[in-house]
């Protein structure tokens, strides 16, 4: 399907002008290539009428032009002095007329209505309000005032000053007679319907002295605003319906093939399940305006959308509406990224979030979509740091890999973390994307102790087991803070013999803190990555306490939480029997190593990678 998009149907009246806007993907090639407007002939050929290269056909000379707006991927064709002969089928497009990078447009030019002299024309959108002004002479001031609608050769009474109201206008029409001295009465019709369209006659008095005034009421369906957005991107519909409906329920609906309108979301709590996790209805302003944000755009989201107001929260005739025609461009600049990320309880996920690469300095955000109250999205983390305290120690936003992608890591997963999350920046709002986190059955691949208690001044060694499938990955330990996770110094592992023939149950990367200080207290993450792409992580909390027993031969520098199948050995090393493990953060063959040897040497914090059986050696 062509990525060029424009209005399918354009209608106007003889002598008037039209402005036709066509959209295209703003790639550098498209921005600079030829743009054209051509008319389709009976032969199927499309004859150029105007192009961006300055060509204007003789038929269009002096009344048409084409302007390209390369910065936003649009071009506009203006045609003036329309005649009935301009009705027909056209194409707006890029490149060569026959190449298919185009959009079909139907133009219909109709004859203007023949109106009686002195007719006042009122042009109003459906659902809105019109005030028809009816002047009269002083002698008709005390006499009956009335408004009629002309239907063919007959006139049907709509309303009069004797309290008659035509049933078709019940509860939405009123006749106002001003105080003395003002020689004009008004008829106000609310919630206009398409059927209200037509010629009206104001009348004051009767007989040959009566005052008459013709009014032509044109009730228009709102012209849909064209919206051109990228696949996987985001769209915002801003809906301003006016103060009259400020306190009425609002909705956004999508027109279906039967020409009825299916509710997408409304303020009464209804939401189409197809938009679950990727839609928000923003609270309305005091003037009744509101907006709806949809992220993770799909091709099937294309179509005609209406927003409106009605107490039922759905489309009803005669209530104000606004319209959009959404086109979803498949030649998207927004890269593919997983829309569903799966993790296991106790494990972790690393979510890749795209952003506009031209906005590398923009602030990055991650929020959790909540369906309650028409949807809302509390921020969890920003590139400036953590926002929600309940995510302390288990959530971090990283600028890597950069160049249009940032990473969010969430670990210590529970079933409550399942849900929809939005990737955001403070820049281009069209790059808002949605990811769903699903919690599935399974065990975390990385296994670390439960919470660890370290002794001040001693050495602490924390193991992190990883399976063979991660043997080629880079392993790291980092200390979490609310502004990120600072990688701890580690010797460059390089290729290791231990990993070449990976046939053991698991491998080990150890964090050594030597000597333990008060500042070491906090969350530590063990993780794997490939270049700038992050994989799984596991978190462990290290508490620091004073030496408890003075002068004893041995003090365990590391105590981990006891679990049902644990033995705490005299040597100060915790061992867990190789049984089914209930706490996913506990693992088989775990050893928290206490090194009470010479602590003067060695680094403050080091990461040592080795096999389970070779905890003393480090892999170089």
């Amino acid at each position: 399907k062509s990525p060029v998009f424009g209005p399918q149907e354009v209608s106007s009246v003889e002598g008037n002008s039209v402005s036709i806007k066509c959209y295209y993907p703003p790639t550098s090639v498209n921005r600079h290539t030829r743009k054209y407007w051509c008319r389709k002939g009976a032969s199927g050929r499309c004859i150029t009428l105007v192009s961006s290269e300055g060509y204007v056909s003789s038929n269009y000379a002096g009344r048409a032009n084409l302007t390209n707006f390369p910065e936003n991927g649009t071009f506009v064709v203006n045609i003036a002095q329309l005649s009935r002969d301009d009705s027909g089928h056209y194409k707006c497009g890029l490149g060569i007329n026959s190449r298919g990078l185009s959009f079909d447009v139907s133009l219909e030019v109709s004859q203007g209505p023949e109106l009686p002299n002195g007719t006042e024309v009122y042009t109003v959108d459906v659902g809105r309000t019109v005030t028809i002004k009816c002047p009269f002479k002083t002698e008709n001031a005390p006499k009956t005032k009335a408004l009629y609608k002309k239907i063919g050769q007959t006139s049907v009474l709509v309303i009069d000053s004797r309290n008659y109201v035509n049933p078709n206008y019940k509860d939405r029409i009123r006749l106002r007679i001003p105080g003395t001295g003002q020689l004009i009465f008004t008829v106000v019709i609310d919630r206009l319907r398409l059927s209200d369209h037509g010629l009206y006659l104001c009348q004051a008095g009767d007989g040959s002295n009566r005052d008459e005034k013709n009014a032509d009421l044109q009730v228009l369906e709102p012209e849909p605003e064209l919206v051109y957005e990228d696949l996987r991107g985001s769209v915002t519909f801003h809906c301003a319906l006016g103060l009259e409906v400020a306190n009425v329920a609002k909705f956004l609906c999508r027109v279906n093939s039967r020409e009825t309108c299916d509710v997408v979301i409304n303020t009464l709590g209804k939401r189409d399940s197809a938009f679950e996790g990727r839609i928000l209805l923003n609270p309305q302003d005091k003037d009744g305006s509101f907006s709806v944000v949809i992220t993770g755009l799909r091709k099937e989201d294309e179509g005609r959308y209406l927003c409106g107001a009605h107490s039922d929260g759905q489309l009803q005739e005669g209530w104000p509406i606004q319209a959009w025609q959404l086109f979803v461009n498949e030649e998207s600049t927004i890269p593919r990224s997983p829309t569903v990320v799966k993790g296991v309880a106790g494990g972790s996920v690393a979510v890749l979030c795209p952003y506009n690469p031209k906005e590398s300095q923009s602030l990055k955000y991650w929020c959790l979509w909540e369906g309650a109250q028409n949807g809302r999205c509390p921020l969890l983390v920003e590139s400036q740091g953590l926002v929600q305290e309940q995510y302390e120690g288990r959530l971090s936003l990283l600028q890597e890999p950069g160049n249009g992608t940032f990473t969010v890591i969430l670990n210590q997963l529970t079933t409550q973390d399942a849900g929809f999350y939005w990737c955001l920046t403070n820049g281009d709002t069209r790059w808002r994307t949605t990811v769903e986190i699903k919690i599935i059955e399974g065990e975390p691949n990385l296994k670390v102790p439960g919470n660890v208690t370290a002794v001040l001044g001693e050495t602490l060694n924390i193991p992190c087991h990883f399976p063979c499938k991660f043997s080629s990955y880079e392993k790291y330990w980092c200390k979490w803070s609310n502004t990120g996770c600072q990688t701890l110094p580690s010797q460059d592992e390089g290729p290791s013999e231990a990993f070449v023939n990976c046939d053991e149950n698991s491998r080990l990367v150890s964090l050594t803190l030597n000597p333990v200080t008060r500042a070491d207290e906090g969350w530590y993450w063990c993780g794997v990555k490939q270049g700038h792409f992050y994989g799984e992580t596991a978190a462990v909390y290290v508490a620091v306490e004073e030496k408890k027993v003075a002068g004893s031969r041995y003090v365990s520098p590391a105590k981990a939480d006891a679990a049902p199948d644990e033995k705490v050995l005299d040597s100060g090393v915790r061992e867990i029997e190789n049984k089914a493990i209930q706490d996913p953060r506990l693992f088989a063959e775990e050893k928290v190593v206490a090194d009470t040897g010479d602590q003067a040497g060695g680094s403050r914090a080091s990461v040592d990678s080795s096999s389970s059986e070779e905890q003393g050696g480090s892999s170089k």
Epitope: H238, L280, L281, N282, P283, Q284, D285, K286, S289, F290, S291, V293, L363, Y365, C367, E370, A372, Q373, N374, G375, R376, C377, P378, L379, E382, Q384, G385, V387, Q388, W422, L424, N426
Partner: nanobody
Framework: EVQLVESGGGLVQAGGSLRLSCAAS????????MGWFRQAPGKEREFVAR????????DYADSVKGRFTTSRDNAKNTVYLQMNGLKPEDTAVYYC?????????????????WGQGTLVTVSS
């Protein structure tokens, strides 16, 4: 954590105007819903106004509708409350508050960051 500091309070005669400012530091607030609350002596803290992250949507307590207007300048990391037609019953300590919600329906309970407040006294 975002720090909020209110300024612009003072003594004003009934019918007069004041403009309160709320400057944020510590982080940008362009994705925060910002609110104004007030607490009169011996009374509970009450909602006055809120403005969404983009500035496109505002909401006011009935008692101040048509007289107070809130706005924001995300580039300056600042939120404003323009108070016109002040009445003696508007006398209170006015607090600025921030809520880390990117979008959507944010209730008055959702405000997590608070300023120290600025006193507004309206004399009759």
């Amino acid at each position: 954590e975002v720090q909020l500091v209110e300024s612009g309070g003072g003594l004003v005669q009934a019918g007069g105007s004041l403009r309160l400012s709320c400057a944020a530091s510590g982080r940008t607030i362009n994705t925060y819903v910002m609110g104004w609350f007030r607490q009169a002596p011996g009374k509970e803290r009450e909602f006055v106004a809120r403005i969404d992250w983009s500035g496109s949507s505002t909401d006011y307590a009935d008692s101040v509708k048509g007289r107070f207007t809130t706005s924001r300048d995300n580039a300056k990391n600042t939120v404003y409350l323009q108070m016109n037609g002040l009445k003696p019953e508007d006398t209170a300590v006015y607090y600025c508050a921030g809520s880390a919600y990117y979008s959507g329906y944010v209730t008055h309970r959702d405000f997590g960051s608070w300023g120290q407040g600025t006193l507004v006294t309206v004399s009759s």
